[in-house]
Interface confidence: medium
């Protein structure tokens, strides 16, 4: 049988007198009304048992027959109260009631767990009229039960504004355990306890849980669901799953990987994106994160010059966006660059070192000891200087730029001279007499023009003056030099 009725139910005659004892008899109902979309009833209905006490609602009709005999109270006949069956099986159950023919338009509705069942349910109402009463059988069938069909089903009928309610029929759908909570993958710190949770439900209950670690059971003794497994810490990756067992069989959860957090792998593919005289833009591909998010990275820079003191510059940066501009570098210099990143566990090893070079830059300092003096015999201004220190030239000197500004009685004009890198002196023609000449000099490389020296001023008198002392760059802290003749 499809239904597993856990209470004994003998096949009492369904109705007294002429009513059919079962749907298998030759009585043909006068009317068969599908409740909705006409699914075929799959199975037999459960037997009813008249004469048993009834707890459903009862309607007492006030109308009497021609002989003035009071009608008996109206109530649904008893049927099986509890049906237990396996998932995907079919089931059919019914409510039946005998209604005096004086009542018209009686309809039966099905309710599950307090809500009316509307729409495409497999519900059929059949009417068996007789001289005085009509037997009404309301059948409800489900062709392939699911867990969601579990619940308490009742019939309701309205007569004279009275509601007649049947006893409930409890449907219990049994099957393999169904997981409501499965273990989840985690990244855990080595040797640190953590919990895994597994919960499964029937029916049938109870559901017992077995834990499996790397294909071996952790517990040979099952725990009732729900189960929380406290793992006392791992030293290596493990796969956990749980088995849920009930009387119908077992269901195995998904296997989840528990990873052990570790230091990251070193970054790879460190590459140079751009170089300037004093900075290098690098990028890298992060290594494996060790199952713990990267926090930050460290860029290590050391001079590749074998004569350097080997000191390492360290620049810290955020882990994203795997890009960093290293600044404050010397121009035209070679560097070894490595990258290391960290997570909560610790620092990775340093990436493979790469070589990078800065380009030529404009000199970072001006020529030193600039002196200016007037050579009246040739009507020239002689300029002398010392070239900047090699380290601060930031490239190969290609020459110098001389700025000389002539100021006289409200007139001012600036002239620029370019001179070659050889030597450290220049001569410029006097442009204006009775004027002040202000001279500044900058060193020039292919990388650009460096800063100009502090201005040196010399007064150029009218013709006929003699004996001129030179004007020179002042010592630090002195005011601009002005040679007054």
């Amino acid at each position: 049988a499809i239904t597993e009725a856990r209470e004994e139910a003998k096949p009492y005659p369904l109705f007294p007198g002429p009513f059919p004892g079962s749907l298998q008899t030759d009585h043909t109902p006068l009317l068969s009304l599908p409740h909705a979309s006409g699914y075929q009833p799959a199975l037999m209905f459960s037997p009813t048992q008249p004469g048993r006490p009834h707890t459903g609602n009862v309607a007492i009709p006030q109308v009497t027959s021609v002989e003035s005999k009071p009608l008996p109270p109206l109530a649904f006949k008893h049927t099986v109260g509890h049906i237990i069956l396996s998932e995907h099986k079919g089931v059919k159950f019914n409510c039946s009631i005998s209604v005096p023919n004086i009542y018209q338009d009686t309809t039966i509705s099905w309710w599950k767990d307090g809500k009316e069942l509307l729409g495409a349910h497999h519900a059929i109402t059949q009417f068996y009229p007789d001289d005085e009463v009509t037997a009404i059988i309301a059948s409800f069938s489900i062709t392939s039960v699911q867990r969601s069909d579990n619940g308490s089903y009742i019939c309701k009928m309205k007569i004279n504004n009275e509601e007649i309610v049947s006893d409930p029929i409890y449907i219990e759908v049994q099957g393999l355990p169904h997981f409501t909570k499965q273990p989840e993958s985690m990244n855990v710190t080595r040797n640190t306890a953590f919990n895994l949770t597994c919960q499964a439900v029937g029916p049938p209950e109870p559901v017992n849980i077995f834990w499996v670690q790397n294909s071996s059971r952790v517990n040979e003794q099952p725990e009732k669901s729900p189960s929380v497994l406290t793992v006392p810490g791992l030293t290596e990756m493990a796969v956990f799953s749980c088995e849920a067992h009930n009387d119908k069989g077992l269901t195995v959860s998904k296997g989840v990987q528990i990873n052990i957090k570790a230091i990251p792998s070193p970054p790879t593919e460190v590459s140079i994106r751009n170089s300037t005289a004093h900075s290098i833009l690098i990028s890298w591909v992060p290594g494996f994160d060790g199952y713990s998010p990267f926090r930050n990275c460290s860029i290590q820079v050391k001079e590749a010059d074998p004569l350097s003191n080997g000191s390492v510059m360290i620049f810290n940066t955020s882990a994203l966006p795997h890009l960093y501009q290293i600044k404050q570098l010397q121009a035209l210099a070679n560097y070894s660059i490595g990258v290391s990143c960290m997570n909560e566990i610790g620092w990775s090893a340093v990436s493979p070192w790469i070589l990078a070079s800065t380009t030529e830059g404009a000199p970072s300092v001006a020529p030193l000891n600039v002196t200016v003096f007037l050579n009246e015999s040739s009507d020239n201004v002689d300029i002398r200087w010392m070239k900047p220190p090699t380290k601060q030239q930031d490239g190969e000197l290609v020459g110098y730029r001389i700025s000389h500004v002539w100021q006289s009685a409200g007139i001012s004009k600036e002239l620029l001279e370019e001179v070659g890198q050889n030597g450290s002196r220049a001569r410029i023609s006097v442009q204006v007499h009775n004027a002040t000449c202000t001279v500044r000099i900058a060193a020039v490389t292919r990388g650009g023009v460096g800063p100009f020296s502090d201005p040196v001023k010399i007064f150029i008198p009218a013709h006929g003056w003699v004996d001129y002392a030179p004007s020179s760059t002042p010592a630090p802290g002195n005011a601009d030099p002005v040679l007054i003749i």
């Epitope: 059971r217 040979e220 003794q221 810490g233």
Partner: antibody, heavy 118, light 106 residues
């Protein structure tokens, strides 16, 4: 009460085979794994491996792969250990032990002394 | 595999003394179990999962530890405690035992 009763002592020659049994009672045999442990004279305890009494799958420690075999007869709640090609160094007392959560050996057999001697 | 080293190998104590024996693992383990073995009998389960006393074990015994270092302590030694005590780990296969600490009562 829970008991693990092992078969009696065995005297064997090198190259022979011995089979030790361990009969469990007082609990559901297939609900707990069964481990095998031995102790050579003057030495400590050493774990040979275990058998899953639910599935019948054995697991062997590295030192005991090959000549050692675990088996079950669940109909009589018995686990067995068979050692082939016995060697002198197999002389030891062999214990079966019921394995609870986290390999806790909660119940032990009384031990079976296997002596291998020419 | 994880190797367990027990120390001392032999421990001599007078009744009433407090004694501690240690079990060190070559790498960190999750749980440490302890067993008592007397000559002529099988090992008895003694302390489960680091610190839980097995049924019938006197309360003067206690277990503690974490990581790679575990210990079994007897607060007041009695004559019946004379035995060899073995530690055993479950954190990775194979299950391994320590070499044992033999407790002698003076």
């Amino acid at each position: 009460q829970i008991q693990l009763v092992q078969s009696g002592p065995e005297l064997k020659k090198p190259g022979e085979t011995v089979k030790i049994s361990c009969k469990a009672s007082g609990y559901t045999f297939t609900s707990y794994g069964m481990s095998w442990v031995h102790q050579a004279p003057g030495k400590g305890l050493k774990w040979l491996g275990w058998i899953n009494t639910y599935s019948g799958v054995p697991t062997y420690a590295d030192d005991f792969r090959g000549r050692f075999a675990f088996s079950l007869d669940t109909s009589v709640s018995t686990a067995s250990l068979e050692i082939n090609n016995l060697q002198n160094e197999d002389t030891a007392t062999y214990f079966c032990a019921r394995e609870d959560n986290w390999a806790w050996f909660a119940y032990w057999g009384q031990g079976t002394l296997v002596t291998v001697s020419t | 595999q994880i190797v367990l080293s027990q120390s001392p190998a032999i421990l001599s104590a007078s009744p009433g003394e407090k004694v501690t024996m240690t079990c060190r693992a070559t790498s960190s383990v999750g749980y440490m179990h302890w067993y008592q073995r007397k000559p002529g009998s099988s090992p008895k389960p003694w302390i489960y999962a680091t610190s839980n006393l097995a049924s019938g074990v006197p309360a003067r015994f206690s277990g503690s530890g974490s990581g790679t270092s575990y210990s079994l302590t007897i607060s007041r030694v009695e004559a019946e405690d004379a035995a060899t005590y073995y530690c055993q780990q479950w954190s990775s296969n194979p299950r391994t035992f320590g070499g044992g600490t033999k407790l002698e009562i003076k």
